[in-house]
């Protein structure tokens, strides 16, 4: 049979030939009638046989972590007979490690982020060394670490890699290490291999630190004129945090006046102070105000960096404008009665400079043929009014300052024209009436109302009468309905065309003013072709003819 | 898992040389215990080993292709290519890489191949 | 070199059939060092068996290898028609690598 013992050769030999091991027949008896064959990948150019003995030897330097086993092939021939010995068998050359492999890292670039202030012991991250050597072999592929640089903020567990925290750090003081770290085999034992990485950890913020006002005082200047809201300045408070962290907001914490608000600016960090309510330089020409600022975001955890909000004082100087002369009431109303002569006091208006020097004041009336202001704001007429032509009048009163011309201010002067009674009632028509020839006495023949143009106090009450003449002929009677209307009546029996075919009546038309006035109002009554019947059809045919200026036969 | 990718030309003219590249993807081609091969398949034929190399460069190529064959590995990139030179139509193949288990000799896994034609 | 050849050149055979397919190499070869792949049209080929009867990962058990010395074999006990296709072994035992011609199992 076949005698041998388990091949092992050291890899990374440097000689030209290194013994591995003997193959040999149990049969052999040394006397070189048998020939040993060595077959298979590696027979010839990574191991030869003494074909006499059965030696093997290595003829070139191998590398385990390439291949770490050869399975070979082995014959045995006898010589003399061509035949062979033994049966043709496996073996197997393993390669023994050494350790020629230093531990690599093989995820570098390493980078961390760890928010600052972060207790000791906190994880930051586990680096990893690989080594190629064979972890089954001795301590070659075991490994420690060790911290190079990091200390005193970092530690690093030596048989996991784990970097840990083991000082709290400021990142308002420094925001990022280099860490490097050490692998090395054989457990660091004597002739151990190392390996470094770098480690750069970034700390990330945490909102330890509260915004303050570098500035205690702010001075700022408003004018008088600026319209609510406006800008006036801006305020800034420096936080040593970043991000949100950083995130601040301003606010108004004193003002008695309430005159000012904060807004914050959020991309710039800055508390613009806008104006609230608008100033006025003659009431007041400074404010102070007291502001604060706190950040946006903040943890409870973190509440005792932010107790105390910082403050400063702002001191906010009002500048003066000269202003436009400004009136006593926003708007006027005056009255007037109608026919009054021209001349005739209206009212005065009232305006002053608001400024301190108080420029003495000049009025005038824009576009207007009936009234006058003079320079004591004394508004009279230029003509006489009539309430029926125009009842109310709309004036632009327009004051300027004597030194600045150029400061103006205009207000409405509503000016009512009332009411006198000048205007007597009469018809709210014209009347043309018709009666047929054979009406009868009491028949009415045409209903009458009035109209005043004057403006009624109460309500209008008209009085209808005939005239005394009218009265008199008693053809046709007037009987008022006491409601501002009246109805003409026949006061006979029959009309007769031919004899008299048309009638006019004088009618009276008086009002209820003080004193009454009295109207003369002419109704024209037609005496109409009618037939036997009465017929009102054929009666309003030929009233319609005669309206129509027509004659009917 | 360990993935790979050829990439290259497709056409190659008789008398240049092909340049192939592999690129290793879930792994690192520096892992021991493996070599990188290639292999190829003339049209409706058999499996023809080229050769392979092991990260640290030590290469082993088919003796008929020796004089036209170099691998080379770039560790940096996880990449090995294939450079055959004087190409002739005869060289018209499906060219594939593959890792090979160095103790054991087996292809696994294998890239998708690439088709490279030579002709003028 | 180790000449492996693979018969028979071509295996007609059923769904539901077993399927026997035989590598013969020209010189001894380590069992340890034998291998199978089966490749399908435009694919790339990929391992079945290594060290002659060790199933590769994710290999269904109705494929199996025996065989030492000079002649193996790779038996499918019950054919599914995704088993078509050709099937190569290939040798480690010796320098340079090769492979067999392959034999295809087409559907009968």
């Known amino acids: 049979g076949w005698v041998w013992n388990q091949f092992f050769v050291p890899e990374e030999m440097n000689t030209t030939s290194h013994h591995v091991g003997r193959l040999r027949s149990d049969l052999d008896n040394g006397n070189n009638s048998f020939q040993y064959k060595l077959l298979g990948a590696g027979a010839g150019s990574t191991f030869i046989i003494d074909e006499r003995t059965g030696d093997i030897y290595a003829i070139e330097k191998l590398d385990r972590e390439e291949r770490s086993l050869y399975i070979l092939r082995a014959q045995v021939i006898d010589i003399t007979t061509g035949r062979a010995v033994e049966p043709e068998s496996e073996f197997v050359i393993k390669v023994s490690d050494i350790n020629d492999n230093e531990p690599k890292f093989l995820d570098e670039p390493y980078e961390a982020i760890v928010p600052e202030m972060s207790p000791e012991g906190t994880l930051v991250i586990q680096v990893t060394a690989s080594d190629a050597d064979d972890p089954s072999s001795g301590n070659n592929a075991r490994l420690l670490y060790s911290l190079l640089q990091g200390q005193p903020y970092f530690s690093v567990e030596p048989t996991t890699g784990v970097i840990r925290i083991s000082s709290k750090m400021d990142r308002e003081l420094q925001d990022e290490y280099w860490v490097i770290i050490q692998a090395k085999d054989m457990i660091g034992q004597p002739g151990a291999l190392s390996g470094t990485t770098s480690v750069l950890i970034k700390l990330s913020d945490v909102n330890d630190n509260k915004p303050i006002f570098k500035e205690s005082l702010y001075r700022l200047t408003v004018s008088e004129s600026a319209p609510t809201g406006t800008s006036i300045g801006t305020i800034m408070a420096y936080d040593n945090d970043i991000g949100e962290n950083a995130e601040m907001d301003y606010s108004i914490e004193e003002d008695d006046s309430q005159t000012f608000d904060i807004i914050t600016n959020h991309e710039t960090q800055e508390g613009i102070v806008i104006l609230k309510k608008k100033v006025n330089f003659e009431h007041q020409n400074h404010y102070g105000i007291r502001a604060k600022v706190k950040n946006h975001h903040v943890d409870e955890q973190l509440m005792k960096y932010h107790t105390e909000a910082s403050t400063t004082f702002i001191k906010i100087q009002v500048e003066d404008v000269d202003e436009p002369p400004l009136f006593l009431l926003p708007y006027y109303i005056f009255e007037i009665f109608e026919e009054t002569p021209q001349g005739s006091f209206v009212g005065v208006v009232s305006a002053t400079d608001p400024d301190n020097r108080k420029s003495p004041i000049r009025y005038s009336i824009t576009r207007s043929k009936v009234f006058n202001i003079d320079d004591n704001g004394t508004i009279t007429t230029t003509n006489s009014l009539d309430r029926e032509i125009s009842a109310w009048y709309n004036l632009s009163i327009t004051a300027t300052e004597k030194y600045n011309i150029e400061q103006i201010s205009s207000i409405p002067v509503y000016v009512q024209v009332l009411n006198i009674n000048d205007h007597a009632p009469e018809f709210s028509q014209y009347y043309e009436s018709y009666v047929c020839e054979n009406a009868g006495s009491g028949q009415v023949i045409q209903t009458i109302s009035a109209v005043d143009r004057d403006e009624s106090i109460e309500e209008h009450h008209f009085y209808f009468n005939l005239s005394v003449e009218d009265t008199n002929s008693s053809s046709f009677t007037i009987i008022d309905n006491q409601d501002n209307t009246a109805v003409i009546l026949t006061n006979r029996t029959g009309f007769n065309l031919q004899e008299e075919p048309i009638f006019y009546i004088s009618i009276l038309i008086a009002d209820n003013g003080i004193p009454s006035l009295t109207s003369t109002n002419t109704l024209t009554i037609h005496v109409c072709d009618c037939d036997d019947s009465g017929s009102t059809q054929t009666c309003q045919y030929q009233e319609l003819m005669l309206s129509m200026g027509f004659k009917t036969e | 898992q360990v993935q790979l990718q050829e990439s290259g030309p497709g056409l190659v003219k008789p008398s240049q040389t092909l340049s192939l590249t592999c690129t290793v993807s879930?792994?690192?081609?520096?892992?021991?215990?493996?070599?990188w091969s290639w292999i190829r398949q003339h049209p409706g034929k058999g499996l023809e080993w080229i050769g392979y190399?092991?990260?640290?460069?030590?290469?082993y190529y088919n003796p008929s292709l020796k004089s036209r064959v170099t691998i080379s590995v770039d560790t940096s990139k996880n990449q090995f290519s294939l450079k055959l030179s004087s190409v002739t139509a005869a060289d018209t193949a499906v060219y594939y890489c593959?890792?090979?288990?160095?103790?054991?000799?087996?292809?696994?896994?294998w890239g998708q191949g690439t088709l490279v034609t030579v002709s003028s | 070199e180790i000449v492996l050849t693979q018969s028979p050149g071509t295996l007609s055979l059923s769904p539901g059939e077993r399927a026997t397919l035989s590598c013969r190499a020209s010189?001894?070869?380590?069992?340890?060092?034998l291998a199978w792949y089966q490749q399908k049209p435009g694919q790339a080929p990929r391992l079945l068996i290594y060290?002659?009867?060790n199933r590769a990962t994710g290999i269904p058990d109705r494929f199996s290898g025996s065989g030492s010395g000079t002649d193996f074999t790779l038996t499918i006990s019950r054919l599914e028609p995704e088993d078509f296709a050709v099937y190569y072994c290939?040798?480690?035992?010796?320098?340079?690598?090769?492979f067999g011609g392959g034999t295809k199992l087409e559907i009968k």
């Open positions: 593959a890792r090979v288990y160095s103790n054991y000799g087996w292809f696994d896994p």
């Open positions: 879930g792994g690192s081609i520096s892992s021991g215990g493996y070599y």
């Open positions: 190399i092991f990260y640290r460069g030590r290469t």
């Open positions: 060290g002659t009867s």
């Open positions: 290939q040798q480690y035992g010796s320098s340079p690598l090769t």
């Open positions: 010189q001894s070869v380590s069992s340890s060092y």
